[in-house]
């Protein structure tokens, strides 16, 4: 990731680099070519990050936290490149780095501000707690503190509970919303302003379906074009809620185009899948198939939840036998 700001004529150049937790980054620094190159990278003007002079690294007094995590672009030093390759950044690495570059001609000092962000893919969950229904938007690890917004039928909701747990290096956040008795559609957006990354969860409840025993049911599940990008890896899961917990009926992975089916009466139409239609059929219904069916389409950028309520009623024959 390269700098957002680079002021060429200011002697103390200050650039901003945004890194992602556990990924590698480059702290940029350039200089006018010259002989006898000396490069010293320091953190917060105190800790030695990397030293290079007389043609080789000198890491004897390198701060232990940088051991085996830093290197220069050795083949490019003679071309004026003093950038530092920095492995596996952590939130503790955030701060100001100073690059001192000296040659027989001149000495320059560059400052680089490193900011580190975390955004582990959030999830949207649908939960039943006794007689209440909840939608929960949660993110296991995020930094800095994200902006969470809820919408009901595309209208922002001001009520926004946030359960926050802060660990040493990031936040874990749950935002539950009570949707008991509602037929509205809901949307939750979690935004990491530093990483400029936004995730959206969308929940839609379909009209209840009444079916007779032994019949089949077709349940629709089509992504909303606003979020869905077929080029992006995603996963589709169909599950059924039984006594408060969901059991997975089938799932599809776009990366491998694999479909795994756990319920023999479940069927997916391959042709429809190719058209990004993940509607499913459940054959030979029985009374125990009554309940809520959840289609979950998830990628790194969104989760689309579609809920169907199915009521299976005894057929006339079954009823008359009883």
């Amino acid at each position: 990731i390269f700098p957002l700001a680079f002021f060429i004529y200011v002697p103390m150049n200050e650039q901003i680099v945004i890194g992602r937790l556990d990924e590698d980054i480059i702290l940029p620094s350039s200089f006018e070519r010259g002989s006898e190159v000396v490069i010293h990278w320091k953190y917060q003007d105190s800790y030695k990050v990397h030293s290079y002079y007389k043609g080789s690294d000198h890491l004897e007094s390198q701060d232990p936290r940088y051991a085996n995590r830093t290197s220069l672009f050795y083949n490019e030093i003679q071309n004026g490149n003093a950038s530092l390759f920095f492995r596996r950044v952590s939130l503790l690495d955030e701060g100001i780095y100073t690059c001192y570059v000296g040659t027989a001609i001149q000495v320059i000092t560059n400052k680089v501000v490193l900011k580190v962000g975390v955004f582990l893919t959030p999830v949207m969950k649908y939960e039943k707690r006794n007689t209440n229904s909840f939608l929960i938007c949660s993110v296991l690890s995020v930094y800095p503190r994200p902006i969470i917004t809820w919408k009901m039928d595309n209208t922002p909701i001001s009520e926004n509970n946030m359960e926050e747990t802060g660990s040493l290096d990031s936040f874990s956040i749950n935002s539950p919303l009570n949707i008991t008795g509602s037929n509205s559609s809901y949307e939750c957006t979690i935004e990491n302003s530093l990483l400029k990354q936004t995730w959206t969860g969308r929940w839609t409840m379909k009209d209840g379906l009444h079916k007779m025993q032994s019949e089949h049911v077709s349940l629709s599940c089509q992504p909303v074009n606003d979020y869905f990008s077929p080029n992006q890896d995603f996963k589709v899961t169909w599950s059924r809620m039984k006594s408060g917990t969901f059991s997975v009926l089938a799932y599809y992975l776009s990366s491998s185009q694999n479909t795994i089916i756990n319920e023999s009466r479940f069927s997916w139409n391959k042709e429809l899948i190719n058209q990004s239609d993940f509607s499913m059929n459940l054959m030979d219904l029985n009374l125990s198939d009554s309940g809520e069916y959840l289609c979950n389409i998830s990628s790194d950028e969104y989760t689309l939840l579609t809920i169907h309520t199915v009521h299976v009623e005894p057929s006339q024959e079954t009823a008359s036998h009883n």
Partner: antibody, heavy 120, light 107 residues
Framework: QVQLVESGGGVVQPGRSLRLSCAAS????????MHWVRQVPGKGLEWVAV????????DYADSVKGRFTISRDNSKNTLYLQMNSLRVEDTAVYYC?????????????WGQGTLVTVSS | DIQMTQSPSSLSASVGDRVTITCRAS??????LAWYQQKPGKVPKLLIY???TLQSGVPSRFSGSGSGTDFTLTISSLQPEDVATYYC?????????FGPGTKVDIK
């Protein structure tokens, strides 16, 4: 142009202390390593100590280790040499000198020197 | 620590002569060697660094060579203003020891 002006020399008894100063101008002092070099009148040059540009690293000649301390104040553009437990053999002209770069190279500019005489 | 020796300790030569001074390190120092000239009553002046690179403003009659342990400073045609003591200094790592010096004068 680079200017280095030493001060603080004088006559001192063995065992006593003295602090030399070097006022630097004409260059960005905080960007360069600095050395002290001494010379007994009529004899050769002896390297004494070096300090890196930001003061983080210091090195000394064996003959002064544990007795002399090099330091710098970058906000005042000044280099210092604190000399304790002085001996007769420390009598010399002390030169303040600028390193080519950060404190790991040769001297490219010298001051005029200040004479330290250790005598009882 | 690495010791630096110079030879000869002094020499006399005629104006126009080629003069060679040798500096030897007790261990290899690559090309991290500088040469200084100190005229009587003056402060030292840098002549050559990196064993063979001439400092700007220094006359081209001065040249340096060598690498590892053996180095030479050559004055191709001695001039009256070259009367001085010449010192080598290692700077591969501290301590940055000087050689004992070679005094050059005119016959």
């Amino acid at each position: 142009q680079v200017q280095l002006v030493e001060s603080g020399g004088g006559v001192v008894q063995p065992g006593r202390s003295l602090r030399l100063s070097c006022a630097a101008s004409g260059f960005t002092f905080s960007n360069y390593g600095m050395h002290w070099v001494r010379q007994v009148p009529g004899k050769g040059l002896e390297w004494v100590a070096v300090i890196w540009y930001e003061g983080s690293e210091k090195d000394y000649a064996d003959s002064v280790k544990g007795r002399f301390t090099i330091s710098r104040d970058n906000s005042k553009n000044t280099l210092y040499l604190q000399m304790n437990s002085l001996r007769v053999e420390d009598t010399a002209v002390y030169y303040c000198a600028k390193d080519l770069i950060s404190g790991i190279y040769y001297v490219d500019h010298w001051g005029q020197g200040t004479l330290v005489t250790v005598s009882s | 620590d690495i010791q630096m020796t110079q030879s000869p300790s002094s020499l006399s030569a005629s104006v126009g002569d080629r003069v060679t001074i040798t500096c030897r390190a007790s261990q290899g120092i690559s090309n991290y060697l500088a040469w200084y000239q100190q005229k009587p009553g003056k402060v030292p002046k840098l002549l050559i660094y990196a064993a063979s690179t001439l400092q700007s403003g220094v006359p081209s009659r001065f040249s340096g060579s060598g690498s590892g342990t053996d180095f030479t400073l050559t004055i191709s045609s001695l001039q009256p203003e070259d009367v001085a003591t010449y010192y080598c200094q290692k700077y591969n790592a501290a301590p940055f020891t000087f050689g004992p010096g070679t005094k050059v004068d005119i016959k």
